[in-house]
Structure formats: structure tokens, C-alpha cells
């Protein structure tokens, strides 16, 4: 480090700075000798308002220093970022969010949950930071599958649903009436058939949802970015397949009207047996014939597979057959079904170990007579679908 | 030699989103220093949009916070200045420069027009 | 937010004279103040930075002094190609800002 050159000044000895070491201490320092400024952890060297990552200082011919010292200012994660259906509190302080600060996220209760625990720690790389090391935001994810309806098994035509029944029901107009079930709270699950031909046009679907009356004027409005049509389904060749994902543009704001209706646990299969009873709830076809003006419902319970199957060979429905990718519900003597208009609609159960619905069916097909004997309501089997769902929406 | 060079559209319709690259040669962005963009109106008012620092820090104007985002690519050595609903008001010349301005890009300049 | 000011926008010299360009920050900025040349068409080129260190490969007729809120660039012995904007920044605390530049003339 020393280069003597008499002919050159000594520079000041240098101090360091507040939370910081110089090094290499020397008892002078003449032209070309340096040294560089070290912070304690949790401080960054700054000039100013400016980070550096390191600093070294050179002696010049005049005795000078060629850069004045900087300081060790301790680490400031800045403001942390607001979270989205959540909020944030200050655990060391207000406001407070400097080295080793605390701060809570949480949700917004009842609607929204988070996996982890929330508490993000300002670290000396000044990212505020998870107990897991992540330094990305939590997720407020909506709560799915809450209803105020209780299933009593009431096995007669529809009855009119209540607010808060089913908040995931969706709303689909377009050239016709169908329906669909949030999700998430920027997807929904429906039919195939229901949005056919809408890939392209997706400008002419309308979405509606945190609604009783179909024609309502107060309702939220969402509008498809994406239509996902299962790669099985063949549009005027049966159901099978019958499924999609509608993609919304912007998320939507879940409170007690609109609410993600779950996808089922693996478990699933044991709640859907035949004679569970299931509720599907739609604005089709009612006893009249006409669209439902509120949103009915009817509590139905499940069919014996090969039972239905044959009833659909007894009296077939054209082009259409009873697939493994399907189930079907309703009452050997009829009186109660889903009809045209209910369509994309879901067929839901409550999970009883959870306490929450979950979809296990959409609304596919079904007799023309809809509500005949032994005409059962055909619905997609959702169980068979879910890794098609998860792959569209953790690749979108 | 540290050499800076912003690159980007030039014309942006009104409401959209301005995306700009600075593709920094000669030092890398995660070595030291903090990483600037800058703009300049045309009556030559400067006005320090943000940076991002070596270690991916970032600092914004206040003024932009709403609309602005500074993020990097470190394997190709670049930093991006992003923002959104871009208006008339944002039609200037835009550098992006180190730390306290020892190296500036040579500037891009850019027109917000319908 | 600090403002800086430069109250002169024009200043007018003649080759070989000594011109001072001036610099006030509304609130005490320490010694964390750049100086910039900008001649037309071109970006901005640091001359000065820390209030009074001259950064690499600038002629020592610039110098800067000053701390706190006034601040000075000088130029002795003015040549022509000095012809150029001078802009003051302070960088002591987040917004950075700059001052609205002097336009030195040279007769």
C-alpha cells in the first residue's frame, strides 16, 4: 500500500463514518495509498441519496482524497407494497422501515385467506422478506364454496334463491341465456356448448354475476379475455368434453354475493355417490317454459351411472351419449331438473368435513323434456377435469 | 469504457404503456452503482424519473410512483423503465444514466401522439 | 422535494474570463450536488460531482464549491467550446432534482 513519493502531500487521515470501518488503518497515507469504507450489517454505503455497493478512496498529488466519504445509513426497505384484498400493519412502529422492522399482512377477512403467516422482516439486502425467505408479496386468495343456503334435500320444482345462496353463480348472455361458476376470482368454469364460436367473438360475451334477477341493472360486469374449450369437445358430436374456462379480464372483488364456488378435494368422489344430493341453480327454463326471472334452484339427487345410461339408450337424445365424463341427477319420476338456460351452470355439493360447496357437475344436456321420468339432467364430471383446469390456469 | 444506450418506440398512442431498454456495456449493473432514468422536456427541464440500484433496490419519483416501474435483466445487462397510461405530458427525450450522472445513454426520444 | 434554483438563465462571457454559474437548494443538500454540461443535440456530460470533486477527464479550469444550500460552478480562463447549458442536481435525498439550467454565452 505505501508508495512513497516526498514530493506529493500526505492526505487527512480519514474518519470513518458512523456505523462503518475503514480499512486498512495506516498511520499515513501518501499519493496512490487507499482505503475503502466497510458499513455494520443492516447499513448501506450511500453519497447522498445514492447506494453503492463498495467504496474506495485514492490519495492524490495534492493531498486530497479523490471522493469525500460516504455514510453508513441504515437499511430502508421503503414503504412495502400494498397487497391487493389486503392491507398492512406496522409492527415495530409506524411507519417504521428500516433494518429489521417488522410488518403484518393479512387479508380482508371472511372473503380472503393467505397460505402463509404474513410477517415480512426488512433484511440487510433491503427487501422486505418472509419468514420463508420469499420476497414477493403474500396472496390474498378468495375463499371459495361459502353459502347461506343448507341443503334440506327438497326434492319438488325449483325455489327461488336468497341472497348469498350461491354467490358464485355466473350470468352469460349472449346470443342465448347460460351460466357459469366463478372459480377464481378472474375464471369460470362453464359448458363448452355455452361458449362455443366465442373464442373468437368474445366481445359478444357478457358477464354478470352477483345477481338474483337475470335482469337486473345493478350487477358487476366482466368481460372474457380468454375462452378455453376442452380439446375433446366436438361442437354438434355429443357432450363429452363438455367444459370450459373463461378467462376474465380484470379480477373481480368477492364480498357475500360473488364468491368462487371450490373445485373438489380428491376426496370428492366419496360426496357424490348415487342418491347424494347435489343443488344446481340456474335462470333457464322453468315449469312454464319461460327464463326464470330470479335465480331458482333445486336440490337433486345423483343417478346411478348405468341407470341413466340406459335410460338414454330407452329414449335417445340425438348425437348424445352417456360418457364416463359425465353424471347425471334427478328423480326417476321427473319434476325436477335443470333445463335450457341453466346450462355452464354448476351442480354443487357440500363437502360436509369442510363446510364448504364445491362443484362436481356442470349443466350439459338432457332431454328435450326436461323434469320427464327417467329423463335425468346430464352434467360434465368435473373430477375427471381438474388437471385440465389446473394446467390452463397456472399456465395462463 | 461504460457505455449506456436507451432504445424503445418513439411513438406511443395516448392511455398506452412505454416500455424503454438501457443496455449497459462496459460494467455490470449488479458490480455497483445505482441505474437511472432520466427525462428531458423540451424546454430542457431534466426531471429524475428513478433507479434501480446493483442490488435491485429501486426508487421512485414520487410524482410517477402510480405509473412507474424500473426492472432489470441481469444476464443481459439491461434495465427497463416502465410506464403506464402514457399522456402528451410524457413526450420528451429519455436517458438513462449511473449513479450521480457520471455516464449518461446517448438519449431516446419519444413522442406520446394519437 | 428540494428545488434547486439557478436564477440566471443566460449569462454572457468572453473567451479567457472567469465566469461563476450559481446554484441554490431550497433546503440543505450537504455537499451532495452534481454539475452538468449539455451542449445542443447532445446528453447531459458530468463535470462535477460531491459539490467540489471533478470527475475524470475534466479540464481543471472547472471547479466547484459550496455546501449546504449555495452552491458554484466556475470556469476560469472560458474557452469557446464552454459554449453549453450548465445544470445543477442534488442528489442528497429521493426526488433527485435538477435545476433549470444556465445557457452560457460566449461573445
Known amino acids: 500500500h505505501h508508495h512513497h513519493h516526498h514530493a506529493s502531500q500526505p492526505c487527512p487521515d480519514p474518519t470513518a463514518p458512523p456505523n462503518g470501518h475503514i480499512s486498512p488503518v495506516q498511520a499515513t497515507y501518501v499519493l496512490k495509498d487507499s482505503f475503502s469504507v466497510f458499513c455494520k450489517t443492516g447499513f448501506e454505503l450511500l453519497q447522498g441519496s445514492v447506494p453503492l455497493k463498495s467504496f474506495t478512496a485514492v490519495c492524490q498529488k495534492d493531498g486530497s482524497w479523490d471522493r469525500p466519504i460516504p455514510e453508513c445509513s441504515i437499511i430502508d426497505c421503503g414503504p412495502p407494497d400494498d397487497l391487493p384484498n389486503g392491507h398492512v400493519d406496522y409492527i415495530t412502529g409506524p411507519e417504521v422501515t428500516t433494518y429489521k422492522a417488522v410488518i403484518q399482512y393479512s387479508c380482508e377477512e371472511t372473503f380472503y385467506t393467505m397460505s402463509s403467516n404474513g410477517k415480512y422482516v426488512c433484511e440487510a439486502d433491503g427487501f422486505w422478506t418472509s419468514s420463508k425467505g420469499e420476497k414477493s408479496l403474500p396472496v390474498c386468495k378468495p375463499v371459495c364454496g361459502l353459502s347461506t343456503h343448507t341443503s334440506g334435500g327438497r326434492i319438488i320444482g325449483g325455489q327461488p334463491a336468497k341472497p348469498g345462496d350461491f354467490p358464485w353463480q355466473v350470468l352469460l348472455l349472449g346470443e342465448t341465456t347460460a351460466a357459469g361458476a366463478l372459480i377464481h376470482d378472474d375464471w369460470v368454469l362453464t359448458a363448452a356448448h355455452a361458449v362455443y364460436g366465442k373464442t373468437e367473438a368474445m366481445s359478444s360475451l357478457d358477464i354478470r354475476m352477483g345477481i338474483l334477477k337475470r335482469l337486473s341493472l345493478i350487477y358487476t360486469q366482466a368481460w372474457p379475455e380468454a375462452v378455453f374449450i376442452h380439446e375433446g369437445y366436438t361442437h354438434g358430436a355429443g357432450f363429452d368434453n363438455d367444459i370450459a374456462l373463461i378467462k376474465l379480464k380484470n379480477k373481480v372483488t368477492i364480498n357475500r354475493n360473488i364468491m368462487p364456488i371450490c373445485l373438489p378435494r380428491k376426496e370428492a368422489a366419496s360426496l357424490m355417490k348415487t342418491d347424494f344430493v347435489g343443488t344446481v341453480a340456474g335462470w333457464g327454463l322453468t315449469q312454464k317454459g319461460f327464463l326464470a326471472r330470479n335465480l331458482m334452484f333445486v336440490d337433486i339427487p345423483i343417478v346411478d351411472h348405468q341407470k341413466c345410461a340406459t335410460a338414454y339408450t330407452k329414449q335417445p337424445y340425438p348425437g348424445a351419449k352417456v360418457t364416463v365424463n359425465m353424471l347425471c341427477a334427478g328423480l326417476d319420476r321427473g319434476g325436477k331438473d335443470s333445463c335450457r338456460g341453466d346450462a355452464g351452470g354448476a351442480l354443487v355439493f357440500l363437502d360436509n368435513e369442510t363446510q364448504r360447496w364445491f362443484v362436481g357437475g356442470i349443466v350439459s344436456w338432457g332431454s328435450i323434456n326436461c323434469g320427464g321420468s327417467e329423463q335425468y339432467g346430464v352434467y360434465t364430471k368435473v373430477t375427471n377435469y381438474i388437471p385440465w383446469i389446473e394446467n390452463i390456469i397456472n399456465n395462463f | 469504457d461504460v457505455q449506456l444506450q436507451e432504445s424503445g418506440p418513439g411513438l406511443v398512442k395516448p392511455s398506452q404503456s412505454l416500455s424503454l431498454t438501457c443496455t449497459v456495456t462496459?460494467?455490470?449493473?449488479?458490480?455497483?452503482?445505482?441505474w437511472n432514468w432520466i427525462r428531458q422536456f423540451s424546454g430542457d427541464k431534466l426531471e429524475w424519473m428513478g433507479y434501480i440500484s446493483y442490488s435491485g433496490s429501486t426508487s421512485y419519483n414520487p410524482s410517477l410512483k402510480s405509473r412507474i416501474s424500473i426492472t432489470r435483466d441481469t444476464s443481459k445487462n439491461q434495465f427497463f423503465l416502465h410506464l403506464s397510461s402514457v399522456t402528451t405530458e410524457d413526450t420528451a427525450t429519455y436517458f438513462c444514466a449511473r449513479y450521480w450522472g457520471d455516464y449518461w445513454g446517448h438519449g431516446t426520444t419519444l413522442t406520446v401522439s394519437s | 422535494d428540494s428545488v434547486m434554483t439557478q436564477s440566471q438563465k443566460f449569462m454572457s462571457t468572453s473567451v479567457g474570463d472567469r465566469v461563476s454559474v450559481t446554484c441554490k437548494a431550497s433546503?440543505?443538500?450537504?455537499?451532495?450536488v452534481a454539475w452538468f454540461q449539455q451542449k445542443p443535440g447532445q446528453s447531459p456530460k458530468g463535470l462535477i460531482y460531491s459539490a467540489s470533486y471533478r470527475s475524470s477527464g475534466v479540464p481543471d479550469r472547472f471547479t466547484g464549491s459550496g455546501s449546504g444550500t449555495d452552491f458554484t460552478l466556475t470556469i476560469s480562463n472560458v474557452q469557446s467550446e464552454d459554449l453549453a447549458e450548465y445544470f445543477c442536481l442534488q442528489y442528497n435525498s429521493n426526488p433527485l432534482t435538477f435545476g433549470g439550467g444556465t445557457k452560457l454565452e460566449v461573445k
Open positions: 462496459g460494467y455490470s449493473i449488479t458490480s455497483d452503482y445505482a
Open positions: 433546503h440543505n443538500v450537504g455537499t451532495n
